[in-house]
Interface confidence: medium
């Protein structure tokens, strides 16, 4: 199955890394230090 982090969500995480949790078919952003929020866009 394709990883959506490499397609639809390729540029979703602003200051963080896109992670795909396959067993839940879910996408999450692992934020860089000091950043938070849905897309790691808040400081």
């Amino acid at each position: 199955k394709k990883n959506p982090c490499n397609a639809k969500f390729q540029n979703f995480c602003i200051h963080g890394e896109c992670k795909y949790i396959e067993h839940l078919e879910a996408v999450t952003c692992k934020c860089q230090q000091e950043y938070f929020g849905e897309r790691c866009g808040e400081k």
Epitope: K19, H23, L24, E25, V27, T28, K30, G37
Partner: antibody, heavy 124, light 112 residues
Framework: EVQLVESGGGLVKPGGSLRLSCAAS????????MSWVRQAPEKGLEWVST????????YYPDSVKGRFTISRDNAKNSLYLQMNSLRAEDTAVYYC?????????????????WGQGTTVTVSS | DVVMTQSPLSLPVTLGDPASISCRSS???????????LHWYQQRPGQSPKLLIY???NRFDGVPDRFSGSGSGTDFTLKISRVEAEDVGVYYC?????????FGQGTKLEIK
């Protein structure tokens, strides 16, 4: 307002079947894994099932495996639990719960939204 | 299956006093990425459960700062710094690191 509303509970005889529904509103249903949790009278909480966002993956404890089936219809913002071969020990309040939020780094942080529950009574 | 054991099961507390609930798991709740999926739920009388603390120590939205969670591995604690009347209910620890997800038996907090 984020809301989950369960329905479909009732009285059923041992060996019978029941289908529970959960209507979701106020959030993007298709982005969240969903679960069912039950609570027998005067007892604690027991996890019953979880389904992934697209419905591809489903999970059950041994106590209901092979008898219960979780499913979802993202177009209708609805979650379902088909319960077959019901037993007296399945008598409980059944809660629909959201696994959320998945976008945050803390994606898997428990069940953050719960419905009011629907009562299932299995008795002859 | 991971067995979650809470103590005490009944907790009578005087208003304004602190309260502490212990939760032990039969195996480590740390996953391969180093995350620990141990959560605490509050269920007030006649109500649905509510998420209180997620991932050991993170307070959920709107949860008062008198609630705190701590612990690691297999040993976890929920603390209430000063108990208020609205805190009456049953508190459950729960793990979602391993399938099947499991809950503790619950701790009933009541006012003395």
């Amino acid at each position: 307002e984020v809301q989950l509303v369960e329905s479909g509970g009732g009285l059923v005889k041992p060996g019978g079947s029941l289908r529970l529904s959960c209507a979701a509103s106020g959030f993007t249903f298709s982005s969240y894994p969903m679960s069912w949790v039950r609570q027998a009278p005067e007892k604690g909480l027991e996890w019953v099932s979880t389904i992934s966002t697209g419905g591809t993956y489903t999970y059950y404890p041994d106590s209901v495996k092979g008898r219960f089936t979780i499913s979802r219809d993202n177009a209708k913002n609805s979650l379902y639990l088909q319960m077959n071969s019901l037993r007296a020990e399945d008598t409980a309040v059944y809660y629909c719960a959201r696994q959320g939020p998945i976008y945050y780094g803390n994606y898997y942080y428990g069940m953050d939204v719960w419905g009011q529950g629907t009562t299932v009574t299995v008795s002859s | 299956d991971v067995v979650m054991t809470q103590s005490p099961l009944s907790l009578p507390v005087t208003l304004g006093d602190p309260a502490s609930i212990s939760c032990r798991s039969s195996q480590s709740l740390v996953n391969q990425e180093g995350e620990t999926y141990l959560h605490w739920y509050q269920q007030r009388p006649g109500q649905s459960p509510k998420l209180l603390i997620y991932k050991v120590s993170n307070r959920f939205d709107g949860v008062p700062d008198r609630f705190s969670g701590s612990g690691s591995g297999t040993d976890f604690t929920l603390k209430i710094s000063r108990v208020e009347a609205e805190d009456v209910g049953v508190y459950y620890c729960s793990q979602s690191t391993h399938v099947p997800y499991t809950f503790g038996q619950g701790t009933k907090l009541e006012i003395k």
